[in-house]
Interface confidence: medium
């Protein structure tokens, strides 16, 4: 005769409240003779869930037909869960007997939890932008989640990160839990594009993590580098200048010419151009008269980039004698 | 009418061991044994409880450190891998005949020692 | 998790006396009345005294008398006699299935 066994295949039942719970039970043989009831608990305050012959369960369905002759399942569904019900389940075999049943056989019990998600994932990152090659913190903040053990991961532009530091709070038993994760992430010049990834994995997502995101384009200021160069043509009695200032980002930028040290108002043509990698290029020209020029022009482009302290190029201006002479002979 | 443990030893940190309760001159419907322990000069600790149908609970902290387990003849505790701190008397207690949490039957206690 | 604490861990009286342990739990027990008492000598499993926050366990003197409900219980001991010199203990059971013990009172007779 094979020895009855008492099958609770979960050891862990994550539930919701309000929610319906099924508690599974299943037995491998038909003997002895006598009911499963169900208990929560197993010492002597253990409280009766559920019992087929006697009583009034009104929250307590059973999964199958008890009824049925060979029937072998005896898992039951609770319903409308509430933080009153936590605690570990027990099906349990009795022998029939006389004057009353005899406890045969305990299953080795559920522990029915409440489960919470986790709320989606905060990423912010640093207050003020920062230059490449230097370090910034992101921080990722999720809560409401129980039970306590959850799992947290960083990416950037999906490379897994390893400098990070996390805190679950509180430690001690609570109702639910809250995540604080800080990572360090280095800046690279082309992370305008880039982003960081925090991902929460608990067991009441089901395999699915949440994720939340932040632009490093909120985070990075590409510093601009500029060039200023005289073109070797010139139209009529002007020379071009072009000021080209690459590599920039945030778009916030002011461009002012000098001639000489005197800042020049007049309007200047100019492009600005995004770049793959999101930064931008901005190129002004400047057209200077020469026909009344002295030898010793000097013009300065200066660049206000993002709130910066102005960064500025200077180019002493070429002028031929034979370009002088052409702007004579122009001259009427 | 009395229970006894039995199988406390010196043993080495990691080494698993496992105590038996006996339970003798019992005929009952229904009884609760638990298991508790006392380390040297320190209070009562209570570590789990298993019922006449086997089926067991355990303290939060000691949950994963031990297991309770029910044979014909015996009550069995498994310290899966017993530290230093793990050093102390254990003793089976029996609940039998009434139904408020109370022991009424402690054996006499075996004592573990871990160590290197 | 629950936490039964238990004052004075010490208590000293002479013999004829009365002595009075408090044992607080950080949350009602089972029904309000799964708490147990008691008493251990050096060497010896501990001796249940009274069950039920208040019934005497078979053999055990009127002398020691139990009560309380919920979260708040006593043990009294009236006309000390040297051989309850010993430590005392509450436990209590909780609906989570727990059973958990005081801190214990060591009592001293004079």
């Known amino acids: 005769e094979e020895e009855l066994q008492m099958i609770q295949p979960e050891k862990l039942l994550l539930v919701t409240v309000g929610k319906t719970a099924t508690l599974h039970c299943t037995v491998t043989s038909l003997l002895p003779v006598g009911p499963v009831l169900w208990f929560r608990g197993v010492g002597p305050g253990r409280e009766l869930i559920y019992n087929q012959k006697e009583g009034h369960f009104p929250r307590v369905t059973t999964v199958s037909d008890l009824t049925k002759r060979n029937n072998m399942d005896f898992s039951i569904r609770i319903s409308s869960i509430t933080p009153a019900d936590v605690g570990t389940y027990y099906c349990v075999k009795f022998r029939k007997g006389s004057p009353e049943n005899v406890e045969f056989k305990s299953g080795p019990g559920t522990e029915m939890a409440l489960g919470a998600k986790p709320s989606a994932p905060v990423v912010l990152g640093p207050a003020a932008r920062t230059t490449p090659e230097h370090t910034v913190s992101f921080t990722c903040e999720s809560h409401g989640f129980s039970p306590r053990d959850i799992t947290l991961k960083w990416f950037k532009n999906g490379n897994e990160l390893s400098d990070f530091q996390t805190n679950v709070d509180p430690t001690g038993q609570s109702v639910a839990y809250s995540i604080r994760s800080t990572a360090r992430v280095v800046l690279d010049p082309w992370d305008v594009r880039s982003q960081v990834i925090c991902e929460v994995a608990h067991v009441t997502l089901q395999g699915d993590p949440l994720r939340g995101t932040a632009n490093l384009s909120e985070a990075i200021r590409v510093p601009p580098t500029l060039e200023v160069t005289q073109q070797p043509m010139r139209v009529g009695n002007q020379v071009n200048v072009t000021c080209q200032v690459r590599k920039f980002y945030p778009q916030s930028l002011q461009l002012t010419w000098s001639e000489n040290g005197n800042v020049c108002q007049r309007e200047t043509a100019s492009t600005l151009t995004e770049n793959k990698d999101g930064t931008y290029n901005w190129t002004s020209w400047f057209l200077v008269n020469i026909s009344d020029q002295r030898d010793d022009v000097v013009l300065t482009c200066q660049v206000k980039h993002d709130g910066q302290l102005a960064v500025s190029k200077r180019l002493a201006l070429e002028v031929t004698v034979h370009q002088k002479d052409q702007s004579s002979d122009a001259t009427p | 009418q009395s229970v006894e443990e039995s199988g406390g030893r010196l043993v080495t940190p990691g080494t698993p061991l496992t105590l038996a309760c006996t339970v003798s001159g019992f005929s009952l419907i229904s009884y609760y044994i638990s298991w508790v322990r006392q380390a040297p000069e320190k209070g009562l600790e209570y570590i789990g409880i298993i019922n006449i149908g086997g089926g067991a609970s355990y303290a939060s902290w000691a949950k994963g450190r031990f297991t309770i387990s029910k044979t014909s003849t015996t009550v069995d505790l498994k310290i899966t891998s017993p530290t230093p701190e793990d050093t102390a008397t254990y003793f089976c207690?029996?609940?039998?005949?009434?139904?408020?949490?109370?022991?009424?039957?402690w054996g006499p206690g075996t004592l573990v020692t871990v160590s290197l | 998790a629950q936490v039964l604490t238990q004052t004075p861990a010490s208590v000293s009286a002479a013999v004829g006396g009365t002595v009075t342990i408090s044992c607080q739990s950080s949350e009602s027990v089972y029904k309000n009345n799964f708490l147990s008492w008691y008493q251990q000598k050096p060497g010896k499993p501990p001796k249940l005294l009274i069950y039920g926050a208040s019934t005497l366990a078979s053999g055990v003197p009127s002398r020691f008398k139990g009560s309380g409900s919920g979260t708040q219980f006593t043990l009294t001991i009236s006309d000390l006699e040297s051989d309850d010199a010993a430590t005392y203990f509450c436990?209590?059971?909780?609906?989570?299935?727990?059973?958990?013990f005081g801190g214990g009172t060591e009592v001293v007779v004079k």
């Open positions: 207690a029996m609940s039998y005949g009434m139904d408020t949490g109370a022991f009424n039957i």
């Open positions: 436990q209590g059971g909780y609906r989570t299935d727990i059973y958990p």
